[in-house]
Structure formats: C-alpha cells, structure tokens
C-alpha cells in the first residue's frame, strides 16, 4: 500500500472539477490539495461524488482546519454536511442565515438529525434569541421545530416571531410548550379584530387560561371540536354549559362523540345533569339534581 501514497503522474488536481469523479479514495487523498479544496468548495456540490469519496474530502478539510471550518467553507459544504458529526459542528461559528439555509437545504427530506439540531443550536445561541427570520427559516424546513424546544428555550422567542408560526408547526407541542407560546401569541395578535384574531390564535389555545376561553365564548367564534379537545383540562373545567355552547356554536353537537375523552369527560363530571340536558345531546355523567357541589380547592386556599 505504501506506493499508493504518492499521486500518480499527471493526476495532481489543479482544480476541483469533474475529472475527479472516478478517482479512487487513495487517489483523492494523494492528489487533491486541502487548500485548493477549501477555496473551491462551491464546486464539490456540482459533482456527484460517492459517499466514500466525500469521506476523503472531509478528512482533508479536517486536517486543514482542526479547530473548525471557517464560515466561507461551511456555506459551500453541500452534501458534505451530511458527513459531519455533532462534534465537528460544535467547533463552528455560523452567523449567516444564508449559511444556515444552505445547510438545511442539503438536509431537506431527512428527519432533523443530531447534526442539524447541533447546527441550529449553535446558530441560535450565536444570535442570542430566536428572531423572526430565523424562525421563518427553521419552521419552513422543519414544521415541528418549535415543539422540539424546551419551555425555557421557547421563552426566548420574541412575540414578533409568532407571526411566522403556522398551525402545523404546533402539531406536536405539549401543554407546557403552549403555556409559554400562548401569551406571546396573544400579545402578537392583540390588535386584530375578533374573527381574524381567532383564526390566528386558534392553534395556540392549548395554552389558554379559563378567563380567555370565557371571553372567546362571548365572541361567536364557533370553535371546532379538534381545537376544543386540545384545550387544557384545568381551563375547561370551570366553563359553564352555556359558555361551552357559545364557544362551540354549531360544533357543540360533536361533544357527544367525545364524551368519554378528556377534557370533555372531566368537564361533564363537573356540570349539573339538568344543565347538560339543555343541550339535548344525551350527555350523561353530570351531577344529579339536588346534590351540593363543594369546591375543595377553594376551601384549601382559604385555610
């Protein structure tokens, strides 16, 4: 194998071009200068190198930049990005949104890998907060991105960025995350009129408190059952039958199909049966007439 370490005569690469496409691993290693590669990274992506060949090119860059690649190289990594480890990426300082977009484009179609998560983390930390342009970019590539953040991380999202959020971006968020996002959304959309406001706020309502749901019930919003089923149980329980009827409008009939599921099931248990009967839906399980309801949580608070 020793004789293979020298570049064969006439094979030394003068530029990164398609003539390298059938170079074997050892030929790429011996015949491609790392500094040349770094200055012509933009050409690599135009050549359909195999994964084996990309491994060699990565190795050459690693030797040239042991402390981490400069952004001028990172921006043009192309498919070579798929060969990077999170440890490689932690050495980078990515400040340009264009660089981030270029690398996310390469990863399009893949799940969010540990490499991408590390890249985003480095980028956002470098910026100090998740600004609107960054959030726009991230949710465009990864609709579930917001829901992958912890409530603590979400607290750094400025209300102005909420305008970039689409309903599908929140599909996998849990109540703790929506608790953080809802007040931001409320602030972001506060100057909108009733019906427009509801359209925008609807997907965030899993973080809404009881008083906001009561206020919405006065605005003829006709909330659909899917949204209602995602509301916080503790926020739904204090609503009266009349308030739920107003909140759901024509969709109130859907309660029957959901009567065994939370939060509908728990809400039914808190209502008087004769109030439930006024809906005419055959909902069962309410408090029988003549029973007294004690709010133990109020008693504990007073004592």
């Amino acid at each position: 194998e020793v004789e293979k370490t020298a570049c064969p005569s006439g094979k030394k690469a003068r530029e990164i071009d398609e003539s390298l496409i059938f170079y074997k691993k050892w030929e790429l290693e011996a015949c491609v200068d790392a500094a040349l590669l770094a200055t012509q990274m933009d050409r690599v992506n135009a050549i359909p190198f195999t994964y084996e060949q990309l491994d060699v090119l990565k190795h050459k860059l690693d030797e040239l930049y042991p402390q981490g690649y400069p952004e001028s190289v990172i921006q043009h990594l192309g498919y070579l990005f798929l060969k990077m480890s999170p440890e490689d990426i932690r050495k980078w300082n990515v400040t340009s949104l264009e660089t981030l977009k270029a690398l996310l484009e390469v990863n399009k179609g893949h799940e969010m890998s540990p490499q991408v998560a590390t890249l985003i983390d480095r980028f956002v930390k470098g910026r100090g907060q998740l600004d609107k342009d960054t959030l726009d970019t991230l949710t465009a590539f990864y609709p579930g991105y917001l829901c992958s953040l912890s409530p603590e991380e979400l607290s750094s999202v400025p209300p102005s960025s909420i305008w970039a959020v689409r309903p599908q971006d929140l599909d996998t968020c849990d109540p703790r995350q929506l608790d953080v996002l809802y007040p931001k959304a409320r602030l972001a959309f506060q100057n909108m009129n009733g019906s427009e406001y509801f359209v925008k706020i609807q997907s965030f309502l899993g973080g809404a408190p009881t008083e906001d749901l009561k206020a919405l019930s006065q605005q003829n919003v006709s909330m659909d059952l899917a949204t209602f089923m995602k509301l916080r149980t503790d926020a739904v329980l204090p609503l009266t039958v009349a308030e739920v009827q107003k909140l759901l409008g024509p969709h109130v009939e859907g309660l029957k199909a959901e009567e065994r599921h939370r939060p509908v099931r728990d809400w039914i248990l808190r209502q008087r049966q004769d109030d439930l009967d006024t809906l005419g839906l055959g909902l069962q399980g309410g408090i029988p007439n003549g029973y007294l309801v004690l709010d133990l949580s109020m008693q504990e608070a007073l004592s």
Epitope: E18, S19, F22, N45, P48, F49, T50, Y51, E52, H110
Partner: antibody, heavy 118, light 106 residues
C-alpha cells in the same frame, strides 16, 4: 416538467450497430451528469455508461467497454449512445437517466428496446 | 459492491405491511436508494440516503438501515404499489443495483 425521451432502438443482427438518442427537456441539461442503464428481458437493472456534465469524463461498464460510446450535445439537450459490435446479450430496454449532485438516478426516460438477433 | 435483495418475490394483499430487504457485500454507510418499477414503465426514485423520501412519494413508503442491511417498508399496501422494487448503492463507483423484489397480488 422534466422529460427524457429515448429513440433509436430496434432489431439489429449480431455484429451490427445502433445509435440511441435521448432528448431532454424541463431541466438545465448542462448541469446534469447523464447515464444509460439497461434492463434485459425479465432481468434487473445494469448501469452501462455515464458522462459528466461537460462531457469530458466518461465511464463504461466492463461488459460494453470498447464497443459502446457515450456522448452529449448540451446545445441540443441531447444524450447519445453509439453501440457497435452488438451481441445477443446486449438485448435489453435502454433507459437514459439523469444524475444531479448525488450518484442516484432522479429522472428516467421511458426506455427504448434494442433486440440483437439473427 | 454487490447488493442482494430478499425476497425475490412476494405475494401480499391490499392493506398489508410489506418489508423488503437489501444487503450490501460491504459497508455503504447510508448511501442507498430505492426505486419502484411498474411493468412496461421506467423505474422511479422513491427513497435516497437510505431513509429520505423523494418529493411526491407517499408517506406509506419508508426506508431504514445503515452499513450493510437496509429495509424498504410499505406500511399499508395500495393497489398501485404492486411493482418491482430495486435498491442501488452510491457509496462507491461503479454504481450497482440489487436484483429486484417483485410485489404481487395475493
């Protein structure tokens, strides 16, 4: 939309020649590497030949080396395969396919049948 | 690099979960693509990088694996999925295909 249309197939005697063409449209042909892939009746796929975007770098499978010549004309958005000294085992449907950035075949033509028989 | 697909053919019903495997003669990282070919038609790219779905391909198709063992799964077989499926490696030149797996109606 992307279209690749092959032509030039037909019946030829052993030792004869054929020239296949592939007309491309709907994408920037000069940015793409192009390939010929063949499929013998009832068999699997075999990568036959490969040409770089400018036409300067070429690959042939051992089974066709010295007999087949791949070429392209970027001005005409066309790919060609000149097949000489044809043998019975060259009988197959020949597909042209495009390669962009990764060595995978993202677009394929509908194929043209080459039958080598006496 | 040789690719061996198994089974070479299988019979299944609409709604079935179908799994096809592709084994490489040496490690190929995640450099594997899957194609679907219907009778009389050209192959169509389904999956690349072992698990990435090509744009426009239904989500019932999924790929997995790395190294030498790879799997193509159809979660709920549809009438239009009866076809022959091929794997292809792009870890090193020359590019090679598996022998194919024909999915037939039971």
């Amino acid at each position: 939309q992307v279209q690749l249309v092959e032509s030039g197939g037909g019946l030829v005697k052993p030792g004869g020649s054929l020239r296949l063409s592939c007309a491309a449209s709907g994408f920037t042909f000069s940015d793409y590497y192009m390939s010929w892939i063949r499929q013998a009746p009832g068999k699997g796929l075999e990568w036959v030949s490969y040409i770089s975007s400018s036409g300067s770098t070429i690959y042939y499978a051992d089974s066709v080396k010295g007999r087949f010549t791949i070429s392209r004309d970027n001005a005409k958005n066309s790919l060609y395969l000149q097949m000489n000294s044809l043998r019975a085992e060259d009988t197959a449907v020949y597909y042209c396919a495009s390669v962009h950035k990764k060595p995978i075949f993202d677009y394929w033509g509908q194929g043209t049948l080459v039958t080598v028989s006496s | 690099i040789q690719l061996t697909q198994s089974p070479s053919s299988l019979s299944a019903s609409v709604g079935d979960r179908v799994t096809i495997t592709c084994r490489a003669s040496q490690g190929i990282s995640s450099a594997l693509a899957w194609y679907q070919q219907k009778p009389g038609k050209a192959p169509k790219l389904l999956i690349y990088d072992a698990s990435s779905l090509e744009s426009g391909v239904p989500s019932r198709f999924s790929g997995s694996g790395s190294g030498t063992d790879f799997t193509l799964t159809i979660s709920s077989l549809q009438p239009e999925d009866f076809a022959t499926y091929y794997c292809q490696q792009f870890n090193s030149y020359p590019l090679t295909f598996g022998g194919g797996t024909k999915v037939e109606i039971k």
